[in-house]
Interface confidence: low
Amino acid sequence: EICGPGIDIRNDYQQLKRLENCTVIEGYLHILLISKAEDYRSYRFPKLTVITEYLLLFRVAGLESLGDLFPNLTVIRGWKLFYNYALVIFEMTNLKDIGLYNLRNITRGAIRIEKNADLCYLSTVDWSLILDAVSNNYIVGNKPPKECGDLCPGTMEEKPMCEKTTINNEYNYRCWTTNRCQKMCPSTCGKRACTENNECCHPECLGSCSAPDNDTACVACRHYYYAGVCVPACPPNTYRFEGWRCVDRDFCANILSAESSDSEGFVIHDGECMQECPSGFIRNGSQSMYCIPCEGPCPKVCEEEKKTKTIDSVTSAQMLQGCTIFKGNLLINIRRGNNIASELENFMGLIEVVTGYVKIRHSHALVSLSFLKNLRLILGEEQLEGNYSFYVLDNQNLQQLWDWDHRNLTIKAGKMYFAFNPKLCVSEIYRMEEVTGTKGRQSKGDINTRNNGERASCESDVLHFTSTTTSKNRIIITWHRYRPPDYRDLISFTVYYKEAPFKNVTEYDGQDACGSNSWNMVDVDLPPNKDVEPGILLHGLKPWTQYAVYVKAVTLTMVENDHIRGAKSEILYIRTNASVPSIPLDVLSASNSSSQLIVKWNPPSLPNGNLSYYIVRWQRQPQDGYLYRHNYCSKDKIPIRKYADGTIDIEEVTENPKTEVCGGEKGPCCACPKTEAEKQAEKEEAEYRKVFENFLHNSIFVPRPE
């Protein structure tokens, strides 16, 4: 039975029964977040031979080996990967060996085996026999090999049963467990797989086979599987599917996309049954299963469920890649970014029509709107309050709208509004009125002749804060209601805030002509009640962190000696409250006598306050039965047992200081200080670990169904 389109087993180990009849998992297999240690011995899935995507194991308590669960898992194809990996074993607290003794091939992708405190038999597996390239494998933070005492079958009795290969200049026996060797095929087979009896399989077999030189006896196929036979290519009238098998047209027609109920069905293109047409192609009619090349950019209608799509980063712009018609409103709010104009052009440059309104505000990174290089029509079917369909507010570096000599843009309905664009000439706005056909629609205040194109700005009134309240991740501030001569001229307030370890920031920190801006900005509307003081709750802040905050009043033009009059506050420095620290790092214990343990650790990465003390708890554990499976007498010494710290291997506490040559003198002394390059490499390594862990958590933690 083919199972799919991906199996996620979590929380309850009995869900494993879903794998009972699976021979191939078409998709991924996740086994994760089973926190109660269970006895897995009664669970065995000998039918499972192939996983077409990847295998992910994460925090499964009580599972000591995968060999009993998946004794015949032979191939992980890696058709789709989990963060570049086809096999991920992460934070498996009780796993003692991988034990996948029949795993012969990982077709694509690398492996990541990390933070498995009790995991051994890693140095005894030659991954180069399973993967094409081992350079991207990441095996870190598991039990140190010298504490494992890994012994391959027969070594103790001096009758070794396993074959040897060289890894890192070390020629040694290769095995998965104490009683399972790593299978190697005779050199005469070359790249071909072999049977248990070392007979070479058919060239189209992958991993293994039940009979030699027979393309119907393969455990898995090198290329494609069709009607019981491994074939180099799919036969006529069949189509490649999911990277491993051939299906007919009817099968493809009735596949329903697992991702969305709103998508059209699968298509057949270039001999493959796929979810949608590839780039540069479009369906030949909405019901069609076939793709035709687009003339020019492919028409693509994109719709935002919430009606308004906010573009505040390259990531959000990415969602519009390839869109030619945008059904909804665009709110562009780009405050910073590297190479932002070309990135935005890449993702938004094909948009021709926006059915609603376009609003550009606080986009200090923008110098021009030319990234919307194909925009020709704003329908204005939905408008902002005041009947605006093109609204440009507070863009500090905006100098050009479009090149009007080469641009034909129509605004079908609605007015334009321009304010607080100090580098945008009013003549440029008037030109846009003419080109877009909106001349005569705007009223006098819609195009502000004083604060558009006016670099100089004289803010003379001071806003005073009236209260501040903090919690561990929130700051509430209020300030005096600013009362300009004409109360109607006050539009709103903008609060600027950022982390400030030292009290030395200025309003213009990190802001330059390229649009870099280190301040976060929040708009605050006026309280409806004129007697209520305005305020804001800033949330999502870091505990025990000092922030700088200031507020600006957003006002209409008030002429006073030919200057724009406004108001802003001084910069206020305020610290959030302390919180619970993150866990101490690199916990390490060793015994220096029969009645003592020495425990060491590093401070938490996020102290979230001033640390005053640590609490150490311990309890007696039953003797680990796994110890008795090894004959440690055959080793030179019995290693001191410790649990891996889950990050990197650290030397024993009890060892003597290293003897190294330092500063030209010989003799015992401390290790030489790390070079800048080493420090940088360590920093990048730590960063890489963090990025992967975040990716893992974001991928697998989902809200519990209500």
């Epitope: 329903l256 109920s261 709103d262 059209e264 069905g265 009619g285 909405s286 019901q287 069609s288």
Partner: antibody
Framework: QIQLVQSGPDLKKPGETVKISCKAS????????MNWVKQAPGKDLKWMGW????????TYADDFKGRFAFSLETSASTAYLQINNLKNEDTATYFC??????????????WGAGTTVTVSS | DIQMTQTTSSLSASLGDRVTISCRAS??????LNWYQQKPDGSVKLLIY???RLHSGVPSRFSGSGSGTDYSLTISNLEQEDIATYFC?????????FGGGTKLEIK
């Protein structure tokens, strides 16, 4: 205005044949599949299958293989359901329904008013 | 085939009431659950697709929720025109299957 207009009620004897029509208007007929749904008196709805209006290729649910046939008259934007060798249990109201959003019709956003077929000797 | 069960075949409520109609699938249908309204004259129309998405033109007093195998349709403020039979339908796996229907009446 998007609508599906079905033919009127029909009274037939067992063993006879009935052909129900469903005329589409207000949208491109060949862009969206046509589904057929049966509702026996006092019973729930039962999906019979669909026809690809682009290719004319029908797909039948297991219970409706054999005596039932879907066909098209594309020039008239009309789909047909024909039931041969009528039985008493074919007495029901038959709806045509089109999914204007999804090729295989995970949901049907346009429905005909239904055609009641009565089979009685 | 996936069986769809509407345990309540008929339901009486007063105008202005909040009414909830439930539907259960025999297996996980991954939110591919749609709701239809059949008026006494026999006409059928789509109300909600993909568990909670309101079809265009449907009043906002209708809402849907659920996940896995259990789903429900809620009418927040019952009006006279809502008197009808309501069917659920799964769109996860062919053949599409409908629930037995829940007939809504006025007390």
């Amino acid at each position: 205005q998007i609508q599906l207009v079905q033919s009127g009620p029909d009274l037939k004897k067992p063993g006879e044949t009935v052909k129900i029509s469903c005329k589409a208007s207000g949208y491109t007929f060949t862009n969206h599949g046509m589904n057929w749904v049966k509702q026996a008196p006092g019973k729930d709805l039962k999906w019979m299958g669909w026809i690809n209006t682009n290719t004319g290729e029908p797909t039948y649910a297991d219970d409706f293989k054999g005596r039932f046939a879907f066909s098209l008259e594309t020039s008239a934007s009309t789909a047909y359901l024909q039931i041969n060798n009528l039985k008493n249990e074919d007495t029901a109201t038959y709806f045509c329904a089109s999914p204007l959003y999804y090729r295989n019709g995970r949901y049907f956003d346009v429905w005909g008013a239904g055609t009641t077929v009565t089979v009685s000797s | 085939d996936i069986q769809m069960t509407q345990t309540t075949s008929s339901l009486s409520a007063s105008l202005g009431d909040r009414v909830t109609i439930s539907c259960r699938a025999s297996q996980d249908i991954s939110n591919y659950l749609n709701w239809y309204q059949q008026k006494p004259d026999g006409s059928v129309k789509l109300l909600i697709y993909y568990t909670s998405r309101l079809h265009s033109g449907v009043p906002s007093r209708f809402s849907g929720s659920g996940s896995g195998t259990d789903y429900s349709l809620t009418i927040s403020n019952l009006e006279q025109e809502d008197i009808a039979t309501y069917f659920c339908q799964q769109g996860k796996t062919l053949p599409w299957t409908f629930g037995g229907g829940t007939k809504l009446e006025i007390k």
